[in-house]
């Protein structure tokens, strides 16, 4: 029985560990600068890099821009969004900015988008200061099933600050849904 | 048999538990206030609270600075940093400010700093108000490894709000590296 | 002893899976803007929605406008508010604003309430742009009590955008208390 | 790499201006407090102007007051000093430097509270 008792604590500690493992999905994606789109309207960011630098992913899918859920459970989302402006990169169309960021959710099948959390600031970026800084951060608690996907939709994306400790978001699972 | 069973139940839960509460390092770090240096340049911020008011840590350690990790593990990093000004405090040598923060991770074995996280503004605080305050959130998830450092790096460390639920930063660890 | 084994793990399986879930819970509480107060001075927010739209809540309570702990752990508590301003609104009584969000702990047992985080910024809503936003979000890793409640203060209530994505806040428990 | 650039150094004689530029490069710090200094040969570092950010409050050395006058464009770069009624005593090398600390300090007026300092111009006052 001894063995056996063994047997069981052993085969038990790699199930715990590997369910443990697999129950975990996360995601951190930082910006790909090499493809932001220009303009100010609000547009959605499909660029983003999973698997260089702090970008990774696991048990979660990146795919045509949006983060994919692939399995059910309540996740902590976050974002974190950078704009800048240097006077060198030339004048702005309007010292009068709206920055913001929208965390959205697509369910595939039933096609609908809602945005889950926004954030952002009106800004007055005048010429008076060569140099403008902004950032935003958001984040928040969601239930989410399996194939809906995530996105992320800024303003004004040509002012992004490209650099991965700057723009980037993310998604870890907390828990299972009852 | 039963008792077998029941041992290794009482067992499995006793070892469910201890690793459970092993597994999970956290820390959350308040500012001390007491020596924070001045200047206005890009500083990196060394004397946190760790074990009075809202700080606490366990399984991590606080040494010169910085928060050291102590096991592997995909952590959630965060810091809220609070600047404020009043005019009682004297004059702005400057009302344009670049308020920033930057959250760095140390690698001892390859002796390199990189930067996670940034955020900020800039702010024109002008004289025309008596007050100015503003306040940065950023957070991620990092695979962090047992020996690498968390610091924080602030631009104008003078105008930091010194209280513990202005200006602190913190980890929790939310699972194991596969 | 195998068929003694395989009850054993089952045994386990629900039980790991059961305690895992009645260890974590959880709420995301929505802003309720049926009932926002207006003025401009320091008030505690009471009206939330926690079972409609992104709102949820699961082994916390919900009552008299505060968020009450069920279960002793760590928590990690998190909060984003939107503010904003429409010229057909109607006029600002004042164009300097102090836009703050305190995040607050309060105990029954020792009748006090203590700020766990802070946010904010002072903001200049001039009348030369029609429309002014502004976000804030805060997060931070808390030791919780059973009976514990978590309320939420703002300044400039009456400027609270009403969206669910826009003004919320939450906690997850992500560890027990050793 | 941050660098100050100072220009518009030369020979004048006794009585003469000069106008003097401070630009930076490699950082933004066309809205920090600045100040210039000189330095005679022989002689120690000495104060010679100050201006914020924004350009609303100036400082000058005892030796400058009423002669020299700093300024900054409305947008950014570069820090002006304006050096007029010059004298045999004012011939140094002069230097500009950014002010290090968030708040005016009473010390504004001391070398060790700025970094980055440029190559410096020469000026001469001579006939």
């Known amino acids: 029985i001894r063995a056996e008792k063994a047997m069981v604590d052993g085969s038990w500690l790699d199930l715990a560990k590997r369910s443990k493992l697999e129950a975990q999905p996360f995601a951190h994606l930082t910006i790909n600068a090499t493809d932001i789109p220009s303009g100010s309207h609000k547009v959605s960011l499909s660029s983003w890099y999973h698997d260089r630098g702090w970008a990774k992913i696991s048990n979660m899918t990146f795919s045509n821009g949006k983060l994919i859920v692939n399995q059910d459970g309540f996740y902590y989302l976050y974002a974190n969004i950078c704009f800048r402006h240097h006077e060198t990169s030339g004048d702005l169309a309007t010292e009068y900015l709206q920055l913001m960021v929208y965390v959205t959710k697509t369910s595939i099948k039933i096609p609908s988008s809602h945005t889950l959390m926004k954030g952002g600031s009106t800004k007055y970026w005048s010429g008076n200061s060569e140099f403008h800084f902004y950032s935003i951060n958001v984040g928040g608690f969601f239930k989410l099933r399996s194939g809906e996907e995530i996105s992320i939709e800024v303003s004004n994306p040509s002012l992004l600050d490209p650099d991965q400790d700057a723009t980037y978001f993310g998604a870890f699972k907390v828990r299972d849904i009852d | 048999i039963r008792a077998e069973k029941a041992m290794v139940d009482g067992s499995w839960l006793d070892l469910a538990k201890r690793s459970k509460l092993e597994a999970q390092p956290f820390a959350h770090l308040t500012i001390n206030a007491t020596d924070i240096p001045s200047g206005s340049h890009k500083v990196s911020l060394s004397s946190w609270y760790h074990d009075r008011g809202w700080a606490k840590i366990s399984n991590m350690t606080f040494s010169n600075g910085k928060l050291i990790v102590n096991q592997d593990g995909f952590y959630y990093l965060y810091a809220n940093i609070c600047f404020r000004h009043h005019e009682t405090s004297g004059d702005l040598a400057t009302e344009y400010l670049q308020l920033m923060v930057y959250v760095t991770k140390t690698s001892i074995k390859i002796p390199s700093s990189h930067t996670l996280m940034k955020g900020g503004s800039t702010k024109y605080w002008s004289g025309n108000s008596e007050f100015h305050f503003y306040s940065i959130n950023v957070g991620g998830f990092f695979k962090l490894r047992s020996g690498e450092e968390i610091s924080i790096e602030v631009s104008n460390p003078s105008l930091l709000d010194p209280d513990q639920d202005a200006t602190y930063f913190g980890a929790f660890k939310v699972r194991d590296i596969d | 002893i195998r068929a003694e084994k395989a009850m054993v793990d089952g045994s386990w399986l629900d039980l790991a899976k059961r305690s895992k879930l009645e260890a974590q819970p959880f709420a995301h509480l929505t802003i309720n803007a049926t009932d926002i107060p207006s003025g401009s001075h320091k008030v505690s927010l009471s009206s939330w929605y926690h079972d409609r739209g992104w709102a949820k809540i699961s082994n916390m309570t919900f009552s008299n406008g505060k968020l009450i702990v069920n279960q002793d752990g760590f928590y990690y508590l998190y909060a984003n508010i939107c503010f904003r301003h429409h010229e057909t609104s109607g006029d600002l009584a004042t164009e300097y604003l102090q836009l703050m969000v305190y995040v607050t702990k309060t105990s029954i047992k020792i009748p006090s309430s203590h700020t766990l985080m802070k946010g904010g910024s002072t903001k200049y809503w001039s009348g030369n742009s029609e429309f002014h936003f502004y976000s804030i979000n805060v997060g931070g890793f808390f030791k919780l009590r059973s009976g514990e409640e978590i309320s939420i203060e703002v300044s400039n209530p009456s400027l609270l955008d009403p969206d669910q994505d826009a003004t919320y806040f939450g906690a997850f428990k992500v560890r027990d208390i050793d | 790499e941050v660098q100050l650039v100072e220009s518009g150094g030369g020979l004048v004689q006794p009585g003469g201006s000069l106008r003097l530029s401070c630009a930076a490069s490699?950082?933004?710090?066309?809205?920090?407090?600045m100040g210039w200094f000189r330095q005679a040969p022989g002689k120690g570092r000495e104060f010679v102007s100050f201006i914020t950010g924004s350009g609303g409050t100036t400082y000058y050395g005892e030796s400058v007051k009423g002669r020299f006058t700093i300024s900054r464009d409305n947008a950014q770069n570069p820090v002006y000093l304006q050096m007029n009624s010059l004298r045999p005593e004012d011939t140094a090398v002069y230097y500009c430097?950014?002010?290090?600390?968030?708040?005016?300090?009473?010390?504004?007026?001391?070398?060790?509270?700025?970094?980055?300092w440029g190559q410096g111009t020469l000026v001469t006052v001579s006939s």
């Open positions: 430097g950014v002010y290090r600390r968030t708040y005016i300090s009473s010390t504004y007026s001391e070398s060790s509270e700025y970094d980055y």
């Open positions: 490699g950082r933004t710090f066309s809205r920090s407090a």
